[in-house]
Amino acid sequence: SAPSMPWPWSPAALRLLQRPPEEPSAHAFCHRAALNISFQELGWDRWIVHPPSFIFHYCHGSCGMPTSDLPLPVPGAPPTPAQPLFLVPGAKPCCAALPGSMRSLRVRTTSDGGYSFKYEMVPNLITQHCACI
Amino acid sequence: GLECDGRTSLCCRQQFFIDFRLIGWNDWIIAPTGYYGNYCEGSCPAYLAGVPGSASSFHTAVVNQYRMRGLNPGPVNSCCIPTKLSSMSMLYFDDEYNIVKRDVPNMIVEECGCA
């Protein structure tokens, strides 16, 4: 039978807390924001030929959470190290990309000023999920 | 990644024992009663992104390029975060109070870096 005393948070609520809506204006809590970045601005255009720009996602927002509102896990939802750390004075949760969740970007590159080209994967460039970690 | 030794203020891994009893989780996490989960703390100056093992990804390099050019310095905070996590074997109740023993991923912070 299910627990008779309801647990404070469901796994779904926990996921919502960790991955809030992606609309930055919605609130200041940790979320994924977007920026159009050109490789020219970065000074990488002599290396990366195509695409000229890409949508750069980054994590932004606060991770402040009063201890009374701590997301408590439930049976069946194993904890993440970040959760207990709200109680540790030195450990300040940081709004960042979840480790292991970054995607690569396929680009066309040159190393000889444009005489020859090859396709490469730029690793760990696209942020998929943000969380307070 | 750096280990916190009390002398560095840079992003490092701080050893820390998480006691499930103290945070009231010992009613559904059966074993262990606690473990060294550790955490990351310290500053992430722009130059640290270029230090091998401290930059968590190519993404960090992009952010720092932007910062150093003063293009959009505001929105992206530099974070000292886990860059390597490991799993731990745990015994716990699922939501129907059946007992589950499994290796739970991302339980232990092994290394930290700037993101």
């Epitope: 039978s1 | 059966i30 059946n98 023993k101």
Partner: antibody
Framework: QVQLQQPGAELVKPGASVKLSCKAS????????MYWVKQRPGQGLEWIGM????????NYNGKFKTGATLTVDKSSSTVYMQLSSLTSEDSAVYYC???????????????WGQGTSVTVSS | QIVLTQSPAIMSASLGERVTMTCTAS???????FHWYQQKPGSSPKLWIY???NLASGVPARFSGSGSGTSYSLTISTMEAEDAVTYYC?????????FGGGTKLEIK
């Protein structure tokens, strides 16, 4: 040493309620689940439910969900089981037992109370 | 729920004899979450064998346990008079946790 103290006997009338107690000593009360087990005369053992003294979280055997209520008083290190609307079927010995850690992820009901004999009779 | 069926319900054995009693589960149970309890008349049950094959503190070495999946057994290598009591198997893998009906061991 670990001890679980239960009153010896309770005599109750049909339809009435009874609140059984189990006082724990000799260990950190809030670190262990407490279990209740029923044994009718000459019969086997039946698991009723469990309560965690730290949080008050409970889990019941569906069969006993309406008839039994488990509660805890941390200040006196005592767990209680209230049995309501009693019938002759509830005449039994009720044991409380600590669910303890045996090492290497092994758990079991390692310490038992002496049991309270409940007799339902008019 | 997982039903545990113990057989035989009552068995007789001579002193010094080898005794085996069995417990069959209606569905598979992890050997880690399977125990045996001993109960003497008028007393509370005592943990006897935990996690299928580990003897609880103070249990004589003549006792052993084995099994996996749906079939488990308790064996006494040489029966002694004090062993003539009731034994219950128990699983806590799936809620609700259940006990077998018991095997009462008597002296022949």
């Amino acid at each position: 040493q670990v001890q679980l103290q239960q009153p010896g006997a309770e005599l109750v009338k049909p339809g009435a309620s009874v609140k059984l107690s189990c006082k724990a000593s000799g260990y950190t009360f809030t670190n262990y689940w407490m279990y209740w087990v029923k044994q009718r005369p000459g019969q086997g053992l039946e698991w009723i439910g469990m309560i965690h003294p730290n949080s008050g979280s409970t889990n019941y055997n569906g069969k006993f969900k309406t008839g039994a209520t488990l509660t805890v008083d941390k200040s006196s290190s005592t767990v209680y089981m209230q049995l309501s609307s009693l019938t002759s079927e509830d005449s039994a010995v009720y044991y409380c037992a600590r669910w303890g850690y045996g090492g290497n992820y092994d758990y079991a009901m390692d310490y038992w109370g002496q049991g309270t004999s409940v007799t339902v009779s008019s | 729920q997982i039903v545990l069926t113990q057989s035989p319900a009552i068995m007789s054995a001579s002193l010094g004899e080898r005794v085996t009693m069995t417990c069959t589960a209606s569905s598979s149970v992890s050997s880690s979450y399977f125990h045996w309890y001993q109960q003497k008349p008028g007393s509370s049950p005592k943990l006897w064998i935990y996690s299928t094959s580990n003897l609880a503190s103070g249990v004589p070495a003549r006792f052993s346990g084995s099994g996996s999946g749906t079939s488990y057994s308790l064996t006494i290598s040489t029966m002694e008079a004090e062993d003539a009591v009731t034994y219950y198997c128990h699983q806590y893998h799936r809620s609700p946790w259940t006990f077998g009906g018991g095997t009462k061991l008597e002296i022949k």
